[in-house]
């Protein structure tokens, strides 16, 4: 769509184009399957424009339909990863708070591969916190070209 000159002068946040691209900070301790993310220009090619981080989890600040994307590469990977473990080795992205909106948005399995990646369009609301849960004995790479997570506001 064409923007007026006045709109062109506005910061992206005021246009509703919230966007974030994050890199892995660390995994959780025992019994905590969450991945903890970080973002900012000092860290390299990661940033937050609108959304914010709350203890390593991504919080949405504007209602809308978002493209959510994630890629995770394992630093410790067995060529027989899935068959070696009794529990499924999966990555799930979901709304983890508020509890009333808790839902899984993406679920992926490491089927004898070392990298998984996916994306989807989904409605998100202000205050939604997205959690990325890695289930199983897995250690993801912190290389920023191998493991990343982001959202992009698409439309109201």
């Amino acid at each position: 769509q064409r923007l007026s000159r006045a709109q062109q002068q506005l910061p992206l946040e005021s246009l509703g184009w919230d966007i974030a691209e994050l890199q892995l900070n660390h995994t959780g301790p025992q019994q905590d399957p969450r991945l903890y993310w970080q973002g900012g220009p000092a860290l390299g090619r990661s940033f937050l424009r609108g959304p914010e981080l709350d203890k390593g989890q991504l919080r949405i600040r504007r209602d809308g339909i978002y493209m959510v994307h994630i890629q995770v590469t394992l630093a410790i990977c067995s060529s027989t990863s899935t068959s070696r473990h009794h529990h499924p080795t999966t990555l799930a992205v979901g709304i983890c708070s508020p509890a009333s909106r808790s839902i899984s948005l993406l679920r992926l399995s490491f089927h004898q591969g070392c990298t998984i990646a996916s994306q989807r369009l989904t409605p998100l609301a202000r205050g939604d916190t997205l959690c990325t849960n890695l289930t199983g004995t897995l250690l993801p790479s912190r290389n920023t070209d191998e493991t990343f997570f982001g959202v992009q506001w698409v439309r109201p």
Epitope: H26, T27, D32
Partner: antibody, heavy 120, light 108 residues
């Protein structure tokens, strides 16, 4: 300066146990995955076990699975390896080693090692 | 598991000469995730090369790594007296992470 200092090795009888420790300093210990690697006298290096920075994930070589347990105490900047049901073939110098920051298990710093001798 | 075979077992050379060490994997190494280490008697290994060709911090540029897939090479362009040691390759693409059994570079 990054330093890793192993201790706890010694002479033990077959079937016995030891607890190896690795005291780390000079870096943010909890940010790094760690491994134990061993080297039998005059032999090749062998990766034994790894643990994530948070301690939430652990990994073992098949030869030690079920007998060895890796753990860490990030408040004490210390890595451990509990070694049980020891066999003669476990005789080796045991090194603790730091993974690269990426988490990949190539080892940018190593300790000087602690010798475990299993003999009756 | 991936078996790494290093050759030759021993390399006898003089200071100033070029050393070429080979490491061959029994199957393709994921992402060329291969490292080289130097070990001197009574000491711990020291990281030289990671990712098949990236020099570790503080490693002189006379050390270089190359190769991909199953065939990898460590080259020391001009041997210095302190370079005489045992060199190990290690693959970290797949668990279990395996090491070669080393090439000894000795003074001729």
């Amino acid at each position: 300066e990054v330093q890793l200092l192993e201790s706890g090795g010694g002479l033990v009888q077959p079937g016995g146990s030891l607890r190896l420790s690795c005291a780390a300093s000079g870096f943010t210990f909890s940010s790094y995955a760690m491994s134990w690697v061993r080297q039998a006298p005059g032999k090749c290096l062998e990766w034994v076990s790894a643990i994530s920075g948070s301690g939430g994930s652990t990994f073992y070589a098949e030869s030690v699975q079920g007998r060895f347990t890796i753990s860490r105490d990030n408040s004490k900047n210390t890595l451990y390896l509990q070694v049980n049901s020891l066999r003669a073939e476990d005789t080796a110098v045991y090194y603790c080693a730091r993974h690269d920051y990426s988490n990949y298990p190539y080892f940018d710093y190593w300790g000087q090692g602690t010798l475990v001798t299993v003999s009756s | 598991e991936i078996v790494l075979t290093q050759s030759p077992g021993t390399l006898s050379l003089s200071p100033g000469e070029r050393a070429t060490l080979s490491c061959r994997a029994s199957q393709s190494v994921r992402g060329n995730y291969l490292a080289w280490y130097q070990q001197k008697p009574g000491q711990a290994p020291r990281l030289l090369i990671y990712g098949a060709s990236s020099r570790a911090t503080g490693i002189p540029d006379r050390f270089s790594g190359s190769g991909s897939g199953t065939d990898f090479t460590l080259t020391i362009s001009r041997l210095e007296p302190e370079d005489f040691a045992v060199y190990y390759c290690q693959q970290y693409g797949y668990s279990p992470f395996t090491f070669g059994c080393g090439t000894k570079v000795e003074i001729k």
